[in-house]
């Protein structure tokens, strides 16, 4: 336990007094928190928490899902923790298969271990396929496996967490990585026609095509020198991964002379913005 000056509040004391504890499945977990100002135990695994207001945490028949971090907190807000592994040969991994990665960021494959003494904790491709050569990862038995700097090419990559147990490779359930692309260029915008000459009463219809890597791109039709958002109809398509197209059609059913002017199709993403204009001239 950390040493403190007399009179200063100190963190609670936990028995057994070790940072990690390994118990077998079916055995008892018995954790005692000693502190005159005891408040609660908190159990945490896969970022989910449970609380217990008794100073002795007892689980009579431990299961793999009891693996996790047990934290005792006192009234001063000071705490102490012990990590319990419940060794279950039939359930080596606890998993949350939701797996999203933002391009160029790290992402965590959530497959913490129930037994820290297995070896070669790593990622493997599904169906015996190799992982991409540039995929780097850092394993942490208590959290999972961190994939470093996710690439766009990893989208829909199928993988397993893997360990060696008694000389055999054991795989977790499948994870499928969904990659959200980073915007690395401005949207591409084009217009069906650069200028229109219409008679009064005729219909004005113009289509702006916006292309980008994802549907998160923002677009709107505006009248130049006006902030008013115009009514438009949108259709959109995904032409495979990271190839998104939106068509925004602006319609004035019966054009009037005072509708004449410049109309701008504006699009932006987190990288920047782009616009294209079309000119309408209405004559009577």
């Amino acid at each position: 336990q950390p040493s403190v000056s007399p009179g200063e509040p100190s963190p609670p004391s936990i028995h057994p007094g070790k940072s990690d504890l390994i118990v077998r499945v079916g055995d008892e977990i018995r954790l005692l928190c000693t502190d005159p100002g005891f408040v609660k135990w908190t159990f945490e695994i896969l970022d989910e928490t449970n609380e217990n207001k008794q100073n002795e945490w007892i689980t009579e028949k431990a299961e793999a899902t009891n693996t996790g971090k047990y934290t005792c907190t006192n009234k001063h807000g000071l705490s102490n923790s012990i990590y319990v592994f419940v060794r279950d040969p039939a359930k080596l991994f606890l998993v949350d298969r939701s797996l999203y990665g933002k391009e160029d960021n790290d992402t965590l494959v959530r497959c913490p271990l129930t037994d820290p003494e297995v070896t070669n904790y790593s990622l493997k491709g599904c169906q015996g396929k190799p992982l991409p050569k540039d995929l780097r990862f850092i394993p942490d038995p208590k959290a999972g496996i961190m994939i470093k700097s996710v690439k766009r090419a990893y989208h829909r990559l199928c993988l397993h967490c893997s360990v060696d147990q008694e000389g055999k490779s054991v795989l977790s359930e499948k994870f499928i990585l969904k990659v959200r692309p980073a915007f690395k260029a401005v949207p591409v915008v084009s217009v069906s026609k650069a200028s229109y000459l219409l008679r009064e009463g005729e219909e004005f219809t113009v289509t702006c095509t916006i292309k980008d890597v994802s549907s998160s791109v923002y677009s709107t039709w505006k009248r130049e020198n006006s902030q008013t958002k115009l009514q438009e109809k949108c259709n959109s398509w995904h032409h495979g991964d990271f190839n998104y197209e939106r068509q925004a059609t602006l319609t004035i059913s019966s054009a009037r002379v005072n509708d004449s002017g410049v109309f701008m199709c504006y699009a932006n993403n987190t990288f920047g913005s782009a616009n294209v204009t079309t000119t309408l001239e209405v004559v009577d």
Epitope: D96, S98, I176
Partner: antibody, heavy 117, light 111 residues
């Protein structure tokens, strides 16, 4: 235990906007994606969008893009959805739902939004 | 968008018998053998409750009377035997592809 708390009802005027909350407890808020779902008798259940864990990126159903805005306040473990330019078609029950292990494992009780002059 | 079509829209089943609800997707919701299809139960005034995830996995705490099957585009929720408490509306949902979509629902009445 995981809980998602939503206010029961909001009465708003046409043309106004409403910002509803979803307060999360029982888990690390920044580690899970939060989705929003609209339910009306006519249209059934419709996915509005998601705010992703950690960095607050969002993804929207195209139908609700520009209509709904999803945000989150990490310090209070609360997700928010703002709906603007309200019309009678926005009258519905709106749910927040936490994604866990690929599915919507936890739902709020829902906020009934009534748009009426 | 992936369209999910549920059938029937409503059905009435006698207590103790089997109820079968179908959900057909307009395109495959499978990736590498994982079917991103889930089933929910909803009772009036309550949020949807997860029953089955990834096509065939029973959610913790859900009675074993509920089961799910299917892959790619065709999925089935089976309740066998039906109990009085199962009167509700059932929805399928896919999250293989944005935007995530729900089926139109099947209202189950117990006779």
């Amino acid at each position: 235990q995981v809980q998602l708390q939503q206010p029961g009802a909001e009465l708003v005027k046409p043309g106004a906007s409403v910002k509803m909350s979803c307060k999360a407890s029982g888990y690390t808020f920044t580690s899970y994606n939060m989705h929003w779902v609209k339910q009306t008798p006519g249209q059934g259940l419709e996915w509005i969008g998601v705010i992703y864990s950690g960095n607050g990126d969002t993804s929207y159903n195209q139908k609700f893009k520009g209509k709904a805005t999803l945000t989150a306040d990490k310090s209070s473990s609360t997700a928010y959805m703002q709906i603007n330019s309200l019309t009678s078609e926005d009258s519905a029950v709106y749910y927040c739902a936490r994604e866990r292990d690929t599915r919507f494992g936890n739902w709020g009780q829902g906020t009934l939004v009534t748009v009426s002059a | 968008n992936i369209v999910l079509t549920q059938s029937p829209a409503s059905l009435a089943v006698s207590l103790g018998l089997r109820a079968t609800i179908s959900c057909r997707a307009s395109e495959s919701v499978d990736i590498y053998g994982n079917s991103f299809m889930h089933w929910y139960q909803q009772k009036p005034g309550q949020p949807p409750k997860l029953l089955i995830y990834l096509a065939s996995n029973l959610e913790s705490g859900v009675p074993a009377r509920f089961s799910g099957s299917g892959s790619r585009t065709d999925f089935t929720l089976t309740i066998d035997p039906v109990e009085a408490d199962d009167a509700a509306t059932y929805y399928c949902q896919q999250n293989n592809e944005d935007p995530y979509t729900f089926g139109g629902g099947t209202k189950l009445e117990i006779k």
